[in-house]
C-alpha cells in the first residue's frame, strides 16, 4: 500500500468565472481503503472542498461514479466559479480508521486561476 | 461514525412478506454500496444482494432473485430488503453491510435482524 | 460461480501457538492486479468483523497477529500467536464476481 500514489495531472488550472472547473485527481491504488477529500490550501488553514465519506457540498460534483468497482478517478468539477475560489487545491487520499480516517497521502496539487467573466 | 440500525425481530406465517430495514448515519448514504446478508441458526453466511443508492443499481444472488427486492430512501438514508413468500428454512438473522471501498466487502455491520418463519 | 472451500472446518490451538486457515477457490479469483479475497471474524451473538481485505491488507484496528497470504485459487489466514480472544468463526468471501462465502472454521482453544 505504500506504493500507493494520488496524482493531480494539471499544476494549474484556469477558468473564466461564471463557468465550472474540473481539478483532476486519481490514484494508483485500491489499497489503502479509505475515502479521498479535497482542500484548499495546505497546513492547519486549509479549507475542505469536498468529503467523499460524507457532508453536503451543493457546488462540487465528482467527475466518475465513485461507488463503481476499481475506480480509482476523484475528479471533481466544481460549478459557478468566482474569485475567491482561486488558490491551490490538494486531493488527499485517506486510510480507513477507527473512529476517525487517517490522512494517508496528498497529491501535488492544483492551482486554479481565475478570469474575468468575458464581456 | 459509521452506524447501521436495524429494524427490530419479525415473526412471519410461512407464504408471507417481510421488509427489514436499516437506516445508515456518519456517512453520506449514496456514496457507498449497502449489502444483504443472512445467517440461518447455526450455519454460515450467505450473500443474498447489494444495492448502491445512488443510483438503485442492484445485483442479486440467483437463489434470490425471484424473491427478494432491495430499495433504499435516500431521505432518510434507510437501505431495505423484502424477502416475499417465506418459508420456514428463511429463519434466520438477515444482516446489512456497508461497503466502504467499493470492493463488493463488507466493512460495517447492521447487529442483525432476527425473522422467524413458523406456522 | 465461484466456490470457496475452507479447511479445516474446525481448529483446536493452544494459547500463543500459530493457527492456519486456508480457502480455496473453484477458480482464480485474482483480476486486474488483486486477489479478490476477504477474511472475517464472527464471535457469537455478534456481526461479522472485517479482518483482511484484498487477500493481504489488514482492516483497520486488525492486530498485527493476524495476517493473510495466497494468489489465484489458494488463501490462507494466519494468527501467529493465538489469543484467548481470537475464539470464533472464520470465514472468507471472494468478489471476483459476485460475492460469496466459504462455509466457514470454527477456531477453538486446545
Known amino acids: 500500500e505504500e506504493g500507493l500514489q494520488v496524482i493531480q495531472p494539471d499544476k494549474s488550472v484556469s477558468v473564466a468565472a461564471g463557468e465550472s472547473a474540473i481539478l483532476h485527481c486519481t490514484a494508483t491504488s485500491l489499497i489503502p481503503v479509505g475515502p479521498i477529500q479535497w482542500f484548499r490550501g495546505a497546513g492547519p488553514g486549509r479549507e475542505l472542498i469536498y468529503n467523499q465519506k460524507e457532508g453536503h457540498f451543493p457546488r462540487v460534483t465528482t467527475v466518475s461514479d465513485l461507488t463503481k468497482r476499481n475506480n480509482m478517478d476523484f475528479s471533481i468539477r466544481i460549478g459557478n466559479i468566482t474569485p475567491a475560489d482561486a488558490g491551490t487545491y490538494y486531493c488527499v487520499k485517506f486510510r480507513k480508521g477507527s473512529p476517525d480516517d487517517v490522512e494517508f497521502k496528498s497529491g501535488a496539487g492544483t492551482e486554479l486561476s481565475v478570469r474575468a467573466k468575458p464581456s | 461514525q459509521v452506524q447501521l440500525v436495524q429494524s427490530g425481530a419479525e415473526v412471519k406465517k410461512p407464504g408471507a412478506s417481510v421488509k427489514v430495514s436499516c437506516k445508515a448515519s456518519g456517512y453520506t448514504f449514496t456514496n457507498y454500496w449497502i449489502n444483504w446478508v443472512r445467517q440461518a441458526p447455526g450455519q454460515g453466511l450467505e450473500w443474498i444482494a447489494m444495492?448502491?443508492?445512488?443510483?438503485?443499481?442492484?445485483h442479486y444472488n440467483q437463489i434470490f432473485k425471484d424473491r427478494a427486492t432491495l430499495t433504499t430512501d435516500t431521505s432518510t438514508s434507510t437501505a431495505y430488503m423484502e424477502l416475499r413468500s417465506l418459508r420456514s428454512d428463511d429463519t434466520a438473522v438477515y444482516y446489512c453491510?456497508?461497503?466502504?471501498?467499493?470492493?463488493?466487502?463488507?466493512?460495517?455491520w447492521g447487529r442483525g435482524t432476527l425473522v422467524t418463519v413458523s406456522s | 460461480d465461484i466456490v470457496l472451500t475452507q479447511s479445516p472446518d474446525s481448529l483446536a490451538v493452544s494459547l500463543g501457538e500459530r493457527a492456519t486457515i486456508n480457502c480455496r477457490a473453484s477458480q482464480s479469483v485474482r483480476s486486474s492486479g488483486y486477489n479478490w479475497i476477504f477474511w472475517y471474524q464472527q464471535k457469537p451473538g455478534q456481526p461479522p468483523k472485517l479482518l483482511i481485505y484484498?487477500?493481504?491488507n489488514r482492516d483497520s484496528g486488525v492486530p498485527d497477529r493476524f495476517s493473510g497470504s495466497g494468489s489465484g485459487t489458494d488463501f490462507t489466514l494466519t494468527i501467529s500467536s493465538l489469543q484467548a480472544e481470537d475464539v470464533a468463526v472464520y470465514y472468507c468471501?471472494?468478489?471476483?464476481?459476485?460475492?460469496?462465502f466459504g462455509q466457514g472454521t470454527k477456531l477453538e482453544i486446545k
Open positions: 468471501q471472494h468478489s471476483r464476481e459476485l460475492p460469496t
Open positions: 444495492i448502491d443508492p445512488s443510483d438503485s443499481e442492484t
Open positions: 484484498l487477500a493481504s
Open positions: 453491510a456497508m461497503d466502504y471501498g467499493s470492493l463488493y466487502a463488507m466493512d460495517y
